[in-house]
Interface confidence: medium
């Protein structure tokens, strides 16, 4: 008989993980990024758009030199659960207008979801404290008019772009420190 | 082959030390968060500690905090439990194991055996 | 950081399915999806089944699943087979970012 079997494993290294949900976050940039051109095509956005209930982006690009893989990892996986929650919301109250957008904004949510799952996989396999889940948030007030579920869209699909612009840098710059 | 080959237990007398060592080979080493995890004599597995990939998240149970430092040597691929203040009811086989997931380890080491007695 | 409450010990004829249960609390498996199951044979080392609730390690049998409902987690083994007769433990990862186990549960396979 050959050698015994080696113990029960999970999955790859931690780099090949951190490798891999570059790729992820790559792919979900491209998503986001086209759909947003694809918003704009059908409802053109007059300045830029804000909602408060969404996270201020967390790192100018300038001070990602001094980032740290725990602080990176715990507050990437925080705002993203909040868009993940924004853009939940939106195919829920957004409006028929929103209604076109689909089924790219499920793909989406879906990837997005996915990429959480991954980063909560990593923060485990490197030991590094996980928070505990988070109080269930107050429910999002609907959007006051079709209008507003438009600029809505419009602001959480630009944040998220922004967001994911920063993840990838700063997974990249980590992949280094790992 | 993945492997981890724990050394160093023995024969101590209580309030005495002992340093166990944790040798990994077959994987990236510094990538990986690692436990020490403990089991008396025809008792259950006993969590002991948990060291993050590069050291700078260090977490125990209640049981031996204050007395275990554990900590980790990631140009030697070595995992450590520096124990103090030893008492007979630390007396077990001493596992260290690789993380998998938040509390799954995926590879274990044979154990090594400590006996805490007069 | 009380142990997780696993019964004693659990039995079944070959080709049955049996279920460990685990109960916990808020704090640990109520708190995450954050649940492993170890199969540890005398004298050797434990072997991961589960993890992460009802993930299985390649190598590890479809037999063996797991699931979670509030603060209890359960394994069960379908098919029992002579060579699962071992002890088991559960553990959780906690909001204290620490591990604790179940105090084990010997399988017998009559």
């Known amino acids: 008989p050959g050698p015994p079997p080696g113990p029960p494993r999970v999955s790859p290294d931690p780099r090949a993980e951190l490798d891999s949900t570059v790729l992820l976050t790559r792919s979900l940039l491209a998503d986001t990024r086209q759909l947003a051109a694809q918003l704009r095509d059908k409802f053109p956005a007059d300045g830029d758009h804000n909602l408060d209930s969404l996270p201020t982006l967390a790192m100018s690009a300038g001070a990602l030199g001094a980032l740290q893989l725990p602080g990176v990892l715990t507050r990437l996986r925080a705002d993203l659960l909040s868009y993940l929650r924004h853009v939940q919301w939106l195919r829920r109250a957004g409006g028929s207008s929103l209604k076109t957008l689909e089924p790219e904004l499920g793909t989406l949510q879906a990837r997005l979801d996915r990429l959480l799952r991954r980063l909560q996989l990593l923060m485990s396999r490197l030991a590094l404290p996980q928070p505990p889940p988070d109080p269930p948030a107050p429910p999002l007030a609907p959007p006051s008019s079709a209008w507003g579920g438009i600029r809505a869209a419009h602001a959480i699909l630009g944040g998220l772009h922004l967001t994911l612009d920063w993840a990838v840098r700063g997974l990249l710059l980590l992949k280094t420190r790992l | 082959e993945v492997q981890l080959v724990e050394s160093g237990g023995g024969l101590v007398q209580p309030g005495g030390s002992l340093r166990l060592s944790c040798a990994a080979s077959?994987?990236?080493?510094?990538?990986?968060?690692m436990h020490w995890v403990r089991q008396a004599p025809g008792k259950g597995l006993e969590w002991v500690a948990v060291?993050?990939?590069?050291?700078?998240?260090?977490y125990y149970a209640d049981s031996v905090k204050g007395r275990f430092t554990i900590s980790r040597d990631n140009s030697k691929n070595t995992l450590y439990l520096q124990m103090n203040s030893l008492r007979a009811e630390d007396t077990a086989v001493y596992y260290c194991?690789?993380?998998?997931?938040?509390?799954?380890?995926?590879?274990w080491g044979q154990g090594t055996t400590v006996t805490v007695s007069s | 950081q009380s142990a997780l409450t696993q019964p004693a010990s659990v039995s079944g004829s070959p080709g049955q399915s049996i279920t460990i249960s685990c109960t916990g609390t808020?704090?640990?498996?109520?708190?995450?999806?954050?649940v492993s199951w170890y199969q540890q044979h005398p004298g050797k080392a434990p072997k991961l089944m589960i993890y992460?609730?009802?993930h299985r390690p390649s190598g590890v049998s479809n037999r063996f699943s797991g699931s979670k409902s509030g603060n209890a987690a359960s394994l069960t083994i379908s098919g029992v087979q002579a060579e699962d007769g071992a002890d088991y433990y559960c553990?959780?990862?906690?909001?204290?970012?620490?591990?604790?186990f179940g105090g084990g549960t010997q399988l017998t396979v009559l």
């Open positions: 992460d609730v009802s």
């Open positions: 553990s959780s990862y906690t909001t204290s970012s620490t591990v604790v």
């Open positions: 077959g994987f990236t080493f510094s990538s990986y968060g």
């Open positions: 060291i993050s990939y590069d050291g700078s998240n260090k």
């Open positions: 194991a690789r993380i998998a997931a938040a509390d799954g380890m995926d590879v």
């Open positions: 808020s704090s640990d498996i109520g708190a995450y999806n954050y």
